[in-house]
């Protein structure tokens, strides 16, 4: 590290005394101190000698050695107060620039520092500082404005009493510029716009910054438009607004509008779809499949998109049959509008009872007309089996009836013993029957389909069993040969057939 | 015992009906289907449709638009009409019995059967 | 439609050998309850076809034991241990898993 002498931190002289600072290192050094007249420098291999015969308040500052080969970077430094009754500040710069919320360092250095117990910081013509103004001082270097602010741009002086009298320093300009994060903020206003031809449109292109200086324009298909300007300052933003106004669109006006904003920092764009159509329309479609199938006793909601211009006049959820005049719960409708064009609307069907089947309608209207969109709902049930024994033609008949949805699958099984239910030890024969004949196929209705087996001796000690199956669950019946007739034994109940 | 007797005509001219009965005795048409089959040099056995016990339909799609099949219980017939003959539906046609579940419907028991020759 | 094939369309035979018919699916049999329809008839000279075997391998009432069927998915042989003259004819397999139900072409089984 160098070395200064005289090795003191400061040293306090008179105008006019002559000055000496020398500083010695192990290799070249270099003095570094404010910009002040009357300097003389020579520099003798590992020294270097700073002098003045006649030194002014304007050498007032920090003298700095430095060695520029030190790996380290070491320094030393000196301060030099040239304590001039009539000058007490050295201002070392007239005007200072900071970005907001930065230090602003106003550099005003006393040149006497016994002067520091008066000092203060003013605006010009003796204005106070504005509120909030929080700052420092340091005899070495000046006074510190804490986060300067935007706001606090003014021509500052330094204050120092002398004989009970307030000295002042020549103005200083501080400058604080606003931090701009990027280009400016826009908006597009509609984002999405259709109009009829002949009706009037509007299309408003606004950009906002903190800072005056950019530039926005408004573009129709990359063609440049010429629109006046209209600008603004509020919430410490800077606004430009752009307004196309259109009285009568025509197909020409059709496509894309983009907004577009620069400035130093860049450019932001923003664009818009600008529809024109012939007629009103209203457009109906649904994700969903058209058909639906749920199960007894779940929930569906059914929804359908609404694309409409101009909006809709009136729109419901109508319930067409067949099995009841029952009406949708208005409760059960819900809309929700996902742009100024497109809505969705639900209907909630929650836990569906057998008599909620069939189709639900949904339809809308505006001056384009009405339209309909209508769902087919189809309950699943599980199958509800039946048998009856008979004879035809004097031979022995079993017919089993199974009714669900979808269509059951039917299989017969006989199996020894008397049993509500066969198990697979004492199962004798399995008949599953490809094409059990469908009695009944209603849309929305249960499928009931028919099963025959014929029996040509009935076994006293056997049971005959139809289970159906489908999708949704499985059903039963055991039929139990008795001397007396026949017992049909249901799931869960016993019945006698004479 | 189970007998299905065939009764139709033996030529009929391009683009006319072919028309044949089937009267079953031994069973009852509400217990059993009836099948009908033909059987020609160039196209071996082909499966032309069947009216199930409970009076339903199935018909081969090759055959759907012009073949129609229907039955009388209480009289123990059953009818078979294929409409817009060609030279090429020369055959022998024979009606069937489903032998039901327990055959898993494969065919028990087939009538005689009707030669018909398409030919003007 | 199911393709039935039945190769070859003559089986020439010894009385007492052993025949062995085959027939070929052009998709899978089994029928989606799981089983597997398939048939097999014989028409003798101048008669109706009469049912042999059902649902692979179960002989109706009244046919030999020495018939049998054997097969699945879609490979199937109808087997004869012992050939006499009366099982002579045209030998037809059968599909009713899938409408429309169709047969093979036919193999006649005759005297070497």
């Known amino acids: 590290i160098p070395v200064i002498e005289p090795s003191v931190p400061e040293l306090v002289v008179k105008p006019g005394a002559t000055v000496t600072l020398r500083c010695v290192g192990n290799g070249s050094v270099e003095w570094d101190g404010p910009p002040s007249p009357h300097w003389t420098l020579y520099s003798d291999g590992s020294s270097s000698i700073l002098s003045t015969n006649n030194a002014t308040f304007q050498n007032t500052g920090t003298y700095r050695c430095t060695e520029p080969g030190d790996p380290l970077g070491g320094s030393a430094a000196i301060h030099l107060y040239v304590k001039d009754p009539a000058r007490p500040w050295n201002v070392l710069a007239q005007e200072v620039v900071v970005f907001e919320d930065q230090d602003a360092l106003l550099p005003c250095l006393l040149t006497d520092p016994v002067l520091e117990a008066g000092v203060s910081l003013v605006r010009v013509r003796g204005r106070p500082l504005m509120r909030h103004t929080n700052y420092s001082f340091s005899p070495w270097h000046g006074f510190t404005i804490h986060r300067a602010k935007f706001i606090q741009s003014q021509d500052y002086q330094c204050s120092a009493l002398m004989g009970g009298r307030k000295v002042m320093s020549i103005s200083i300009r501080l400058k604080v510029q606003k931090v701009i994060p990027g280009p400016p903020a826009l908006t597009l206003v509609p984002a999405e716009l259709v109009r009829i031809r002949g009706e009037a449109a509007q299309i408003v292109c606004s950009a906002s910054s903190v800072d005056v200086n950019f530039d926005v324009f408004l573009q129709h298909n990359n063609t440049k438009l010429a629109i006046p300007q209209q600008s603004d300052f509020h919430n410490n933003r800077y606004q430009k607004v752009l307004t196309l106004n259109l009285d009568q669109v025509d197909f020409q006006h059709a496509g894309n509008y983009s907004c577009v904003a620069s400035n130093v920092q860049g450019k932001h764009s923003t664009s818009m779809f600008f529809r024109v159509v012939e007629s009103a329309y209203l457009n109906l479609s649904s994700e969903q499949n058209l058909i639906q199938e749920v199960t007894v006793g779940e929930g569906l909601n059914l929804k359908v998109m609404v694309e409409a211009y101009p909006g809709l006049q009136g729109f419901n959820w109508t319930y067409l049959g067949p099995f009841s005049d029952h009406q949708p719960e208005p409760k059960l409708a819900n809309a929700t509008t996902k742009d100024t064009y497109r809505h969705t609307f639900t209907l909630s069907l929650p836990r569906l009872k057998p008599s909620e089947a069939g189709r639900y309608s949904f339809l809308a209207r505006n001056p384009g007309g009405w339209r309909a969109l209508t769902f087919e709902l189809t309950l699943r049930y599980p199958p509800e089996v039946s048998v009856i024994w008979t004879f035809i033609n004097g031979s022995g008949t079993l017919l089993c009836a199974a009714s669900g949805y979808p269509q059951p699958n039917v299989t017969w099984l006989q199996c020894s013993g008397h049993t509500d239910r066969c198990d697979e030890a004492q199962v004798l024969q399995v008949w599953d029957d490809p094409y059990p004949e469908v009695l009944s196929q209603e849309p929305f209705h249960k499928v009931t389909v028919q099963s025959l087996l014929t029996v040509e001796t009935l076994e006293h000690n056997q049971t005959y069993e139809c289970r159906a199956h489908n999708s949704v669950g499985s059903g039963s019946w055991a039929f139990i040969p008795i001397s007396a007739g026949a017992h049909t034994h249901p799931p869960d109940e016993f019945l006698f057939t004479p | 015992q189970v007998q299905l007797k065939q009764s139709g005509p033996g030529l009929v001219q391009p683009s006319q009906s072919l028309s044949i009965t089937c009267t079953v005795s031994g069973f009852s048409l509400t217990t059993y289907g009836i099948n009908w089959v033909r059987l020609s040099p160039g196209k071996g056995l082909e499966w032309l449709g069947m009216?199930?016990?409970?009076?339903?339909?199935d018909y081969n799609a090759a055959f759907m638009s012009r073949l129609t099949i229907t039955k009388d219980n209480s009289k123990n017939h059953v009818f078979f009409q294929l409409n817009s003959l060609q030279p090429d539906d020369t055959a022998i046609y024979f009606c069937a019995k489903s032998g039901g579940l327990r055959l898993y419907y494969a065919m028990d028991y087939w009538g005689q059967g009707t030669s018909v020759t398409v030919s003007s | 439609d199911v393709v039935m094939t039945q190769p070859p369309l003559s089986l020439p035979v010894s009385l007492g050998d052993q025949a062995s018919i085959s027939c070929r699916s052009s998709q899978s049999l089994v029928h989606s309850n799981g089983n597997t329809y398939l048939h097999w008839y014989l028409q003798k000279p101048g008669q109706s076809p009469k049912l042999l075997i059902y649902k692979v391998s179960n002989r109706l009432s009244g046919v030999p034991d020495r018939f049998s069927g054997s097969g699945s998915g879609t490979d199937f042989t109808l087997k004869i241990s012992r050939v006499e003259a009366e099982d002579l004819g045209v030998y037809f397999c059968s599909q009713s898993s899938h409408v429309p139900w169709t047969f093979g072409g036919g193999t006649k089984l005759e005297i070497r």
């Open positions: 009216i199930w016990r409970g009076g339903n339909t």
